[in-house]
C-alpha cells in the first residue's frame, strides 16, 4: 500500500500536451465488500463518437481489467479478457466501471484510458494520476460463490476432529497401559519395604524468551 502511495508521486499533475483528452479519477477508493465504482471523467464528449474506454491495473498498466466499447448508434459493449467481473456505464463525458468480486491481493493502482476511434483523427488521453483501489474484503482468500465458511474450512474441521479423537484414544490407551504396567511393577518390586526419601530439587523448564515481532515493519 505504501509503495503505491509513493509511486503516485512519480506522476506529475495533469497537463495538456497537444490534442490529448484529460482524465480525472478519484485518488483512492476503498472496496469494503469486494466491489467498487470507479468513475473516469473525461474532458471530452463521447456521445457522438466511436470509442474504447478501458481500465488498467498496475503502475505499468500491464493488466487490462475492463473494456467499454461505445458507438453512438449501438448498445454499449462491456467485457473483460482478464477474468474481472466488471460492468460499465456511459455518461456524456464519463465512463463508470463497476468492479465486483475483487480479492484483497487485487489492491493496486488503476488507470483509466480512452481512445476515440471515429470520426478521425484518432485521439487518446494524457496518462492520468490513477486511482488506488484498496480492497478490504471479507475473505482473505478468493471469496467463495456461496456465503458462509468455505469447503476447505469444513475439511480442516473434520480432519482436525478426527486427529483430535485419534490422539485422545491413543493417549487414553497409553495411560491405561502405563498405569497397569506400573501397578504390576510395584507388586513385584524388591524395594517395596524401603522408607521413602525426599527427592532433590527438580529442574525447572522455562520457555525460552521470544522477542515480540515488529509488525509495523511488515506493513506495506
Amino acid at each position: 500500500m505504501l509503495r503505491l502511495l509513493l509511486a503516485l508521486n512519480l506522476f506529475p499533475s495533469i497537463q495538456v500536451t497537444g490534442n490529448k483528452i484529460l482524465v480525472k479519477q478519484s485518488p483512492m477508493l476503498v472496496a469494503y465488500d469486494n466491489a467498487v465504482n470507479l468513475s473516469c471523467k473525461y474532458s471530452y464528449n463521447l456521445f457522438s463518437r466511436e470509442f474504447r474506454a478501458s481500465l488498467h491495473k498496475g503502475l505499468d498498466s500491464a493488466v487490462e481489467v475492463c473494456v467499454v466499447y461505445g458507438n453512438y448508434s449501438q448498445q454499449l459493449q462491456v467485457y473483460s479478457k482478464t477474468g474481472f467481473n466488471c460492468d460499465g456505464k456511459l455518461g456524456n463525458e464519463s465512463v463508470t466501471f463497476y468492479l465486483q468480486n475483487l480479492y484483497v491481493n487485487q489492491t493496486d493502482i488503476y488507470f483509466c484510458k480512452i481512445e476515440v476511434m471515429y470520426p478521425p483523427p484518432y485521439l487518446d488521453n494524457e496518462k492520468s494520476n490513477g486511482t488506488i483501489i484498496h480492497v478490504k474484503g471479507k475473505h482473505l482468500c478468493p471469496s467463495p460463490l456461496f456465503p458462509g465458511p468455505s469447503k476447505p474450512f469444513w475439511v480442516l474441521v473434520v480432519v482436525g476432529g478426527v486427529l483430535a479423537c485419534y490422539s485422545l484414544l491413543v493417549t487414553v490407551a497409553f495411560i491405561i497401559f502405563w498405569v497397569r504396567s506400573k501397578r504390576s511393577r510395584l507388586l513385584h518390586s524388591d524395594y517395596m519395604n524401603m522408607t521413602p526419601r525426599r527427592p532433590g530439587p527438580t529442574r525447572k523448564h522455562y520457555q525460552p524468551y521470544a522477542p515480540p515481532r515488529d509488525f509495523a515493519a511488515y506493513r506495506s
Epitope: Y44, N45, S48, Y72, N92, E93, V116, P119, P120, P121
Partner: antibody, heavy 121, light 107 residues
Framework: KVQLQQSGAGLVKPGASVKLSCKAS????????INWVKQRSGQGLEWIGW????????NYNEKFKDKATLTADKSSSTVYMDLSRLTSEDSAVYFC??????????????WGQGTTLTVSS | DIQMTQSPASLSVSVGETVTITCRTS??????LAWYQQKQGKSPQLLVY???KLADGVPSRFSGSGSGTQYSLRINSLQPEDFGSYYC?????????FGGGTKLEIK
C-alpha cells in the same frame, strides 16, 4: 491565419465532369477533416461528405455517393472534389469547410469562399 | 438519417427586437448541434456549437439553448448586421444534415 482557398467559378456542359479544389493553409493539414457543402441558388445547405487527409478516410452522404469523389494531395495541402455526369441539378455554389472537434462537439469553424458551378449547354 | 425541421422559414423584424429560431430533430442528438449565420453571397459563419457554446468572436446577444430534440437560437436586441440566413446542423452520426434555414429580414 487559417484559410481555405477554393478554385474559381466554372461553366461546364451537361454530362461532363469537373474537379473543384480547396487549398488549406495556416494549420496542420493532416489534423482536420475537410467537408464539402452544396448550396443551390436561394436554397439551403447540403452536406456532401468529408475527407480526412491524415489517413485518407472518406465519408459520403449516401445521396452524393455516385456523384462526388473526394481526394487530396498532401504535398500541396489541397482537397479535391470530382463531380461526374453533370446535370443542371448540380448547378450550385460548393463550399469546403474545416471540421473542428471541440471536446467531442463538432462544428465547421472555417469555410472557403465557395465555388460557383454552372452546368449549361 | 436525422431530419432537421427549422422554423420559421422566414422572419421580418425590426432592429432592437428579440428573435428566437427553433430547430427540431427527428431523434435525440444529445446537444451535438451547431448554428451558422450566412449573409447574401458569403460563406456561412459559425455562431454556436454544442447547442449552447458561443464560438470565438460572436457577440453575447446570441445564445443557444435546448437539449434532446428541441433546440433554439436567440438573438437579443437585433443589430443591422444580424440580418441574413441562419442554419442549424446536427453532428449525431453522418450525414451531418442542415436545417432548411431561416431568413431574417428587416421590417
Amino acid at each position: 491565419k487559417v484559410q481555405l482557398q477554393q478554385s474559381g467559378a466554372g461553366l461546364v456542359k451537361p454530362g461532363a465532369s469537373v474537379k473543384l479544389s480547396c487549398k488549406a493553409s495556416g494549420y496542420t493539414f493532416s489534423d482536420y477533416i475537410i467537408n464539402w457543402v452544396k448550396q443551390r441558388s436561394g436554397q439551403g445547405l447540403e452536406w456532401i461528405g468529408w475527407f480526412y487527409p491524415g489517413s485518407g478516410s472518406i465519408n459520403y452522404n449516401e445521396k452524393f455517393k455516385d456523384k462526388a469523389t473526394l481526394t487530396a494531395d498532401k504535398s500541396s495541402s489541397t482537397v479535391y472534389m470530382d463531380l461526374s455526369r453533370l446535370t443542371s441539378e448540380d448547378s450550385a455554389v460548393y463550399f469546403c469547410a474545416r471540421r473542428e472537434d471541440r471536446g467531442g462537439y463538432d462544428a465547421f469553424d472555417y469555410w472557403g469562399q465557395g465555388t460557383t458551378l454552372t452546368v449549361s449547354s | 438519417d436525422i431530419q432537421m425541421t427549422q422554423s420559421p422559414a422566414s422572419l421580418s423584424v425590426s432592429v432592437g427586437e428579440t428573435v428566437t429560431i427553433t430547430c427540431r430533430t427527428s431523434e435525440n442528438i444529445y446537444s451535438n448541434l451547431a448554428w451558422y449565420q450566412q449573409k447574401q453571397g458569403k460563406s456561412p459563419q459559425l455562431l454556436v456549437y454544442a447547442a449552447t457554446k458561443l464560438a470565438d468572436g460572436v457577440p453575447s446577444r446570441f445564445s443557444g439553448s435546448g437539449s434532446g430534440t428541441q433546440y433554439s437560437l436567440r438573438i437579443n436586441s437585433l443589430q443591422p448586421e444580424d440580418f441574413g440566413s441562419y442554419y442549424c446542423q446536427h453532428f449525431w452520426g453522418t450525414p451531418w444534415t442542415f436545417g432548411g434555414g431561416t431568413k431574417l429580414e428587416i421590417k
